[in-house]
């Protein structure tokens, strides 16, 4: 059938952060090329990454069309130089990916503390609302635009001189925390989607401490 030396892809894996979504697979091709197809449950398969020797395919453009749909991808293997060749079932060898629902599964990217401002015994901490590749009306939506109140942030903060951490939560991107006057504090933030069963939390933001350039201080 011409597929004697063609092997099916395996270990198909979704890698997705803030909806930037790449399908990866093995093996590195030897005398073969790959084409990827992706579909929702509609079965309207769309081909991407035609006859590639890569072992990854960026499917972001497809999944951002509706991040709440569930997607399946499949990777077809063809002999290099003979892409018309088919397997014994009359079609090229292929393997299916696991199902992937971006809204429920994309990893939350590492947040960034955009600014903090102290006014007396209060500190207002703002977490950057990161832009995603999800579009609406030709503009890119932020993480908050996409997830709404499903997304919360947790702030961990502590006196620079001690290790005991306190926490605060917000379903906006801003925290207002109580601090002791004249005492320096450090903090980091984490994005969380409490309703999820997987990939609930992001990695921690870089630690920021009062007295560094991001802060403003007012009596």
């Amino acid at each position: 059938s011409g597929t004697t030396n063609t092997v099916a892809a395996y270990n198909l894996t979704w890698k997705s952060t803030n909806f930037k979504t790449i399908l990866e697979w093995e093996p590195k091709p030897v005398n073969q090329v790959y084409t990827v197809q992706i579909s929702t449950k509609s079965g309207d398969w769309k081909s991407k990454c035609f006859y590639t020797t890569d072992t990854e395919c960026d499917l972001t453009d497809e999944i951002v069309k509706d991040v709440k749909q569930t997607y399946l991808a499949r990777v077809f293997s063809y002999p290099a130089g003979n892409v018309e060749s088919t397997g014994s079932a009359g079609e090229p060898l292929y393997e299916n990916s696991p199902e992937f629902t971006p809204y429920l599964e994309t990893n939350l990217g590492q947040p960034t503390i955009q600014s903090f401002e102290q006014v007396g015994t209060k500190v207002n901490v703002t977490v950057e609302d990161e832009r995603t590749l999800v579009r609406r009306n030709n503009t890119f939506l932020s993480l908050r635009d996409v997830f709404g109140k499903d997304l919360i942030y947790t702030l961990y903060y502590w006196k620079s001189s001690s290790s005991g951490k306190k926490t605060a939560k917000t379903n906006t991107n801003e925290f207002l925390i109580d601090v002791e006057k004249g005492v320096s504090y450090c903090f980091f933030a984490q994005a969380v989607i409490p309703s999820r069963t997987v990939n609930r939390k992001s990695t921690d933001s870089p630690v920021e401490c009062m007295g560094q350039e991001k802060g403003e201080f007012r009596e």
């Epitope: 929702t40 449950k41 509609s42 079965g43 309207d44 398969w45 393997e95």
Partner: antibody, heavy 118, light 106 residues
Framework: EVQLLESGGGLVQPGGSLRLSCAAS????????MGWVRQAPGKGLEWVST????????YYADSVKGRFTISRDNSKNTLYLQMNSLRAEDTAVYYC???????????WGKGTTVTVSS | DIQMTQSPSTLSASVGDRVTITCRAS??????LAWYQQKPGKAPKLLIY???SLESGVPSRFSGSGSGTEFTLTISSLQPDDFATYYC????????FGGGTKVEIK
Amino acid sequence: EVQLLESGGGLVQPGGSLRLSCAASGFTFSDYAMGWVRQAPGKGLEWVSTISGSGGLTYYADSVKGRFTISRDNSKNTLYLQMNSLRAEDTAVYYCAKAPYGYYMDVWGKGTTVTVSS
Amino acid sequence: DIQMTQSPSTLSASVGDRVTITCRASQSISSWLAWYQQKPGKAPKLLIYKASSLESGVPSRFSGSGSGTEFTLTISSLQPDDFATYYCQQYKSYITFGGGTKVEIK
């Protein structure tokens, strides 16, 4: 509740035609591939045809290729199977089914009976 | 086409028995297999997809296993409602069903 209701079955002579319909409710019809599966009296299940959510992709079993046409009207939430050049061996209960990705059937209708006989 | 062979074609069992049905594919289908239950005069009902994923609402006494060419459907403790015919279906290349296994009362 997801429901599928077939209609259009009946008695037809060999060489005749019949159009089956399947009315869907309880889910976003265009979001799913749909299919037809048949079962001859006292026999097992046989896949007949599948259509993608947009209607742009269709697949047929060799036994019906060129004689049967699957279609859908998403505005009416209805799936169709146009059966031409019918043969005695097409006699069966025809089931309509919701088919995620066009792969497996997670919801089935109750079926409609087609009898091809002179 | 990929052929699916089920065994046994008929199985006699009693309530409470552990029942195993086998399905073999003529070539590797990875895990792309579904199991259905059908009662006389009724439509089939999906039990298992992707070889081992239990469909929502299906009792946990049903389980599926296997990959490649050999698959099993297991009913851990047969209940009166389980006497029926069971079909496997591959969806690796188009769709084909096994011939069915009738589970009857011993």
